[in-house]
């Protein structure tokens, strides 16, 4: 929801959580804001008091309930209210109708792993994290591997077009170090985004053998 | 493999209910999504509601809300959908689908349901 | 309540050929669309996701495309095995609703 110079930006975790970002050109750093959910058909609503994280915007996160709890679902809709405290008196400041999985954004994955690890190739396994049993199988995968000498932004982005929680990483150089991440997207909504890059994992290749011819 | 098997073709007399049963294997039927669908003759098919195994919710479109409850059984593995006070136009083919909320990946083989006095 | 509209009812091909089918929602639905191939007898099968997204298992000569709110399944190279009644759906508004289906019938 964007009025003027501000936006209000709100991703579904899939589970129990809702991130939301608010910017406000000109708007006074010492304001007491808060993000206030209001569920169209559910008992509960929820508010999260927003903190800066820049000159001109703040962020909240909405913790609906326990990690793995699915809180809301594919019908579902949330108000979204950003409140500020002008005096006695609350504000509302930006509003938006909240369509959960319509703008998801999972969670980074967790516990990377070397399952194997050879001079040329090495194979890596990872999990997702609180994502809904909605998705079934219908995720897709970016990774990433960071060589010697070069930055995350050069590496090339591999695709895995289906849940896949798994690669084989080919071509590798012998002894050497590396780095790798992964991030996870679903194929549903409108404005889904992915998630942030998972924690790296450092790993290095196997020697080549002496005197082998490799 | 997964796999939903529906029961036996049913007749009813308008005004009665019918419970039809899909029992699921090849997949983890307290993590899924169990739909229904209504498929009459001219009418194509409609979507009737879902329970959500994990969460313990159903939803149902408002055309059949009324009429229809879905209910499961985690010990066997199996969901049901019950319609009650049946007319003419219920008769149908009624299928049990596994799927996200979006849409039904895996289908039961259906169910016929006449109502006829 | 979306409504879904599918053309043509009847679309007659001959084996070989390449078959295009339209669906048509009443309102903008992004890409939540899906569409079913159903035979004679038999229930539905999911054949594309949110538009133009293949599952797997399904031949390559399926395919699907969008533009605004209307939607294409495209079969390029019809087989015997593909004559059937196709179905799109809408996802994005509740309650979900299923288009009256395309007979496609061999030429």
């Known amino acids: 929801a964007v009025n003027g110079t501000s936006r209000f930006t709100c991703f579904y975790n899939s589970r129990a959580n809702i991130s939301c970002v608010w910017s406000q050109d000109g708007a006074l750093q010492d304001t007491s804001c808060q993000v206030h959910a209001w569920p169209d058909r559910r008992r509960w609503n929820q508010t999260c008091e927003l903190l800066p994280v820049s000159q001109a915007s703040w962020a909240c996160n909405l913790i609906l309930g326990t990690p793995d709890s699915q809180k809301l679902t594919a019908v579902d809709i949330v108000t979204l209210r950003v409140m500020c405290r002008e005096g006695v008196r609350w504000r509302m400041m930006a509003i938006q109708d909240f369509k959960p999985f319509e703008n998801l954004r999972l969670m980074a994955p967790i516990s990377l792993q070397v399952v194997h690890v050879e001079t040329h190739r090495c194979n890596i396994s990872w999990k997702i994290s609180q994502a809904s049993h909605y998705f079934e199988r219908h995720l897709e995968f970016e990774a990433r591997t960071l060589s010697p000498g070069h930055t995350w932004e050069e590496a090339p982005l591999m695709t895995l077009k289906q849940k896949q929680e798994w690669i084989c990483l080919e071509t590798l150089t012998p002894d050497t170090q590396y780095e790798f991440q992964v991030r996870v997207k679903p194929l549903q909504g409108e404005f889904t985004t992915w998630s942030p890059w998972s924690q790296p994992l450092a790993f290095r290749t196997k020697p080549a053998a002496l005197g082998k011819d490799t | 493999e997964v796999q939903l098997v529906q029961s036996g073709a049913e007749v009813k007399k308008p005004g009665a209910t019918v419970k039809i049963s899909c029992k699921v294997s090849g997949f983890n039927f307290k993590e899924s999504l169990i739909h229904w669908v209504q498929q009459a003759p001219g009418k194509g098919l409609e979507w009737m509601g879902w329970?959500?195994?994990?969460?313990?919710?159903?939803e149902y479109a408002p055309g059949f809300q009324d009429r229809v409850t879905i209910t499961a059984d985690t010990s066997t593995d199996t969901a049901y959908m019950e319609l009650s006070s049946l007319r003419s136009e219920d008769t149908a083919v009624y299928y049990c689908?596994?799927?996200?909320?979006?849409?039904?990946?895996?289908w039961g083989q259906g169910t016929t349901v006449t109502v006829s006095s | 309540e979306i409504v879904m509209t599918q053309s043509p009812a009847t679309l007659s091909v001959s084996p070989g050929e390449r078959a295009t089918l339209s669906c048509r929602a009443s309102?903008?639905?992004?890409?939540?669309l899906h569409w079913y191939q159903q035979k004679p007898g038999q229930a539905p099968r999911l054949l594309i996701i949110?538009?133009?997204q293949s599952i797997s298992g399904i031949p390559a000569r399926f395919s699907g495309s969008r533009s605004g709110t209307e939607f294409t399944l495209t079969i390029s190279s019809l087989q015997s095995e593909d004559f059937a009644v196709y179905f799109c759906?809408?996802?994005?508004?509740?309650?979900?609703?299923f288009g009256q289906g395309t007979k496609l019938e061999i030429k």
């Open positions: 689908a596994r799927g996200g909320p979006w849409f039904l990946s895996y």
């Open positions: 949110y538009g133009l």
């Open positions: 329970i959500d195994n994990e969460a313990g919710e159903t």
């Open positions: 309102q903008i639905i992004s890409n939540n």
């Open positions: 759906q809408q996802s994005n508004n509740f309650p979900y609703t």
